[in-house]
């Protein structure tokens, strides 16, 4: 807490400029008037004061607004904002993109903060869902976003938002995750034809069904590995070896080098020998000719 | 790991010019404002310039103004000081540095170049 100090003579700030970075801490206390920094604070940004007279203009406005600043003044932050903490973000009300971009331009290239993430969830909650141009700019600013968030908070991102998400934003999901994701993607690109379509809905497939791996299997998609690798192995143990080979086309023969690998693996592990062999890949570990396979997962079902 | 590179010191007569180059990693270049420091023998380190990531803004000691200038090339994540009419007092070791905040103290710099000699002769 500065002390409280009458400011000296010929000091009192008429206006926010570069001659008070030559200011000490208690002066800027002293001679800067609260309600002129806020309504000068888009001038903040452009003078090169320190992290200490930083604190001090922190705390300035703190005392004028100790409700939470207006949007006015949150917009023109700037720097000031890597001094604010998760509970002063708190009592904020950001419901203007721009004003979410200037904030997070301040923390760009650097890891997501308490603030930062503080910052999204609540404008997220203010707009009531993850719209699309809110979706951009946060990918945008950090690729794996839509992977922090939970398979309930993925939940209420509307179908029309996914076309906002580029591939390197799904890397870091987990299966949950696009299990929720993968419908979206299919309603969003529903009207899309055959090829344009694989390639929008690619890199959520790892939250596709197997029926809709049948379906893609009759299109001449020619997935690649990377892709398959990621499919669902419930999804993938029921395709048989003909489907396989249609889904992944020229890239079939990548299975050889993937045989001790999930779903790889499990997928082998289903099929017959001899249908295997028919790939001509050399794939071991599928069941012997001669042997009864009895789906017993079927069977309980009738049951 | 943050690395910050200058090159450009040298021998000058009183008068002359020298460019400094300093060259940074992308992703400290565009994440930081750069700035520029100078430090005498037997003297503290003193600012030089500084260049804000946001919004480009540019500021610089009294005793430079109008003889630097400090500019940055995205494209090449460097950021440069051009001095002329450089005079014997200018004569120090010259450091190139990146701070998360645009401010014209050394203390809130988080990473420095090693530093490059610029000796004026009258």
């Known amino acids: 807490e500065v002390e409280k100090t009458a400011c000296p003579s010929g000091k009192k700030a008429p206006e926010i400029d570069e001659s008070l970075i030559f200011y000490k801490k208690w002066e800027l206390e002293a001679c800067v008037d609260a309600a002129l920094l806020a309504t000068q604070m888009d001038r903040v940004n452009a003078i090169p004061f320190t992290y200490e007279q930083l604190d001090v203009l922190k705390h300035k406005l703190d005392e004028l607004y100790p409700q939470g600043y207006p949007e006015s003044v949150i917009q023109h932050l700037g720097y000031l904002f890597l001094k604010m903490s998760p509970e002063d973000i708190r009592k904020w009300n950001v419901t203007s993109l721009e004003t979410l971009k200037a904030l997070l331009e301040v923390n760009k290239g650097h890891e997501m903060s308490p603030q930062v993430a503080t910052l999204i969830d609540r404008f997220v909650k203010g707009r009531g869902q993850l719209d699309k141009d809110t979706l951009d700019t946060l990918t945008a600013f950090y690729p794996g976003y839509l992977c922090s968030l939970s398979p309930e908070e993925l939940s209420s991102v509307p179908p029309s938002s996914i076309w906002a998400v580029r591939p390197q934003d799904l890397d870091t999901c987990d299966p949950r995750q696009l299990d929720v994701l993968y419908p979206k993607a299919r309603l969003a690109f529903q009207n899309m034809n055959g090829s344009e379509y694989f390639v929008k809905i690619q890199s959520f497939l790892g939250g596709a069904p197997t029926e809709d791996l049948k379906a893609l299997s009759q299109q001449n998609v020619s997935m690649d590995l990377a892709t398959f690798m990621k499919l669902r192995t419930d999804a993938v143990l029921p395709l048989t070896v003909a489907e396989v080979q249609k889904l992944l086309g020229p890239h079939v023969e990548g299975l050889k080098a993937e045989e001790r690998h999930r779903p790889v693996r499990d997928w082998i592990l289903r099929q017959r020998q001899d249908d295997l062999d028919t790939l001509g890949l050399g794939l071991q570990g599928g069941i012997p000719n001669g042997y009864l396979v009895l789906d017993l997962s079927m069977q309980e079902a009738l049951s | 790991e943050v690395q910050l590179v200058e090159s450009g010191g040298g021998l000058v007569q009183a008068g002359g010019a020298l460019r400094l180059s300093c060259a940074a990693s992308e992703r400290t270049f565009s994440s930081s404002s750069m700035g520029w420091f100078r430090q005498a023998p037997g003297k503290e380190r003193e600012f030089v310039a500084a260049i804000n990531r946001i919004g480009g803004h540019i500021y610089y000691a009294d005793s430079v103004k109008g003889r630097f200038t400090i500019s940055k090339d995205n494209a090449k994540n460097t950021v440069y000081l051009q001095m002329s009419s450089l005079k014997p007092e200018d004569t120090a070791v010259y450091y190139c540095?990146?701070?998360?905040?645009?401010?014209?103290?050394?203390?809130?710099?988080?990473?420095w170049g090693q530093g490059t000699q610029v000796t004026v002769s009258s």
């Open positions: 540095a990146s701070s998360r905040i645009y401010s014209h103290s050394a203390r809130d710099y988080d990473y």
